[in-house]
Amino acid sequence: RSDQEPLYPVQVSSADARLMVFDKTEGTWRLLCSSRSNARVAGLSCEEMGFLRALTHSELDVRTAGANGTSGFFCVDEGRLPHTQRLLEVISVCDCPRGRFLAAICQDCGRRKLPVDRIVGGRDTSLGRWPWQVSLRYDGAHLCGGSLLSGDWVLTAAHCFPERNRVLSRWRVFAGAVAQASPHGLQLGVQAVVYHGGYLPFRDPNSEENSNDIALVHLSSPLPLTEYIQPVCLPAAGQALVDGKICTVTGWGNTQYYGQQAGVLQEARVPIISNDVCNGADFYGNQIKPKMFCAGYPEGGIDACQGDSGGPFVCEDSISRTPRWRLCGIVSWGTGCALAQKPGVYTKVSDFREWIFQAIKTHSEASGMVTQL
């Protein structure tokens, strides 16, 4: 971890799953005092750190489990808890007389389980390197990429589901392979698609406002998590994109504009471009809205392309101590592919964290096409 990348202020211990929150005033880590709201606090803590959910939670006793480098406690204001998405807004220093504190196991994410060291201008990737990448196929043909958030939820782009592609029984999600023709990949059906209600082209086909290009696909049954199938992390709450940071875009899309789709998953490393630069007259002239961002090289040459839509743009960081890959962007649109001053444009996932959590909680039993604002 570099000095430029401080630890996220909420942490979960890999040793005993204790939750710890940083006290900025004192410069120390504190434990979360156990309460009747442990389930909600555990879920909120995991979500804040960029995990999809808490799998389990428990209580530990500081007298038996030890302080382990922490000093003191935070208590949760249970009255304000239902009305917040940020744990840090509803905690305050307290005594915690019983000395019992909260531990949680968050759904793991963003880590390769294998020792692994077109996208236009990209290269073939290897099995298990991007285990969250899936292929969304309609009538057997690859149309879009997607990213596993869990065994049964995939995040992708809304524009992958125009009117003509809404018979869900004709969609399949292909995972666990890098070759499109691989017999070893798993293919599952789709139970529901939740797309963003603020994605205007679905209301007006000629709208040129393409913000909110985001959708969730709920699989008909969960994929087994293996060395080749793993979920990606979401950005942590409040985690900003870093201009110039080099991240990775992956997909089976065209290796040149209106060329052939890649048979083997491609990966390309591209830097994030600031919205100020990308909105310049030479780039996209104010077309980049706040919930989008650009990534690529001013001179072009490396980019996502047709068929990569919906796929992951992932950045690695160590803000949770362990290095993890986070889904920072969803491949959305662009002018051509890999052109000078026309970088790829991505949906900014950090702006949709609450939308994602809400959709998954609300629509886990839904079937068919569902919209959520």
Epitope: A141, H142, L143, C144, A157, H159, C160, N165, D204, P205, N206, S207, E208, E209, N210, D213, G253, Y257, Y258, Q261, A281, Y284, G285, Q287, A304, C305, Q306, G307, D308, S309, G310, V331, S332, W333, G334, T335, G336, C337, L339, A340, K342, G344, V345
Partner: antibody
Framework: EVQLVESGGGLVQPGGSLRLSCAAS????????MHWVRQAPGKGLEWVAS????????YYADSVKGRFTISADTSKNTAYLQMNSLRAEDTAVYYC???????????????????????WGQGTLVTVSS | DIQMTQSPSSLSASVGDRVTITCRAS??????VAWYQQKPGKAPKLLIY???SLYSGVPSRFSGSRSGTDFTLTISSLQPEDFATYYC???????????FGQGTKVEIK
Amino acid sequence: EVQLVESGGGLVQPGGSLRLSCAASGFNFSYSYMHWVRQAPGKGLEWVASIYSYYGSTYYADSVKGRFTISADTSKNTAYLQMNSLRAEDTAVYYCARSDSWSYKSGYTQKIYSKGLDYWGQGTLVTVSS
Amino acid sequence: DIQMTQSPSSLSASVGDRVTITCRASQSVSSAVAWYQQKPGKAPKLLIYSASSLYSGVPSRFSGSRSGTDFTLTISSLQPEDFATYYCQQYYSSYYLLTFGQGTKVEIK
């Protein structure tokens, strides 16, 4: 720096022909729409024709359909307007303009969207008179 | 074909005035409307696209808005260099046929 330079205007008799050229530089020609817009003396702007040269897709105003042909040579970054069967009412300053385009990156054919005409040439005068 | 009806055809205003020009589309054109400024003997210049997006380098006193099929160009505080003719234009993507409004000449009062 983006530049559009028109040429080929002049005086022509009714029923005659003329070919206008628009030499483009400073942007990716293949992925831009190129347009011809005219302005009769003392009048407003009238769109004439457009081309999206990557596909070779062409579009015309009803007033010129069948008489004018828009084309592009991507190797020369040049758009052309071939004007046949010219009439007195075709007298105007002819401007070449371009607009950017974008498309989604999914695996099926997407509509290519354009936006406003962001760069214009200086115009070339076409006079149709006997 | 889609018609763009622009009004007024001309107006007189003073420096510092707030000026509003409107355009009505004969049918839905979504937000695919641009506004241009043209000075005598010069090519038009793009001011606004997608109904309300300010083109790069255009002063922020220019703004655009949409209400259904009605589109408005507003100059919040008219400057001496703003005396010119203004045109609206639709570029509705289904048809790729562009049409301009008749123009509004903004003159010095």
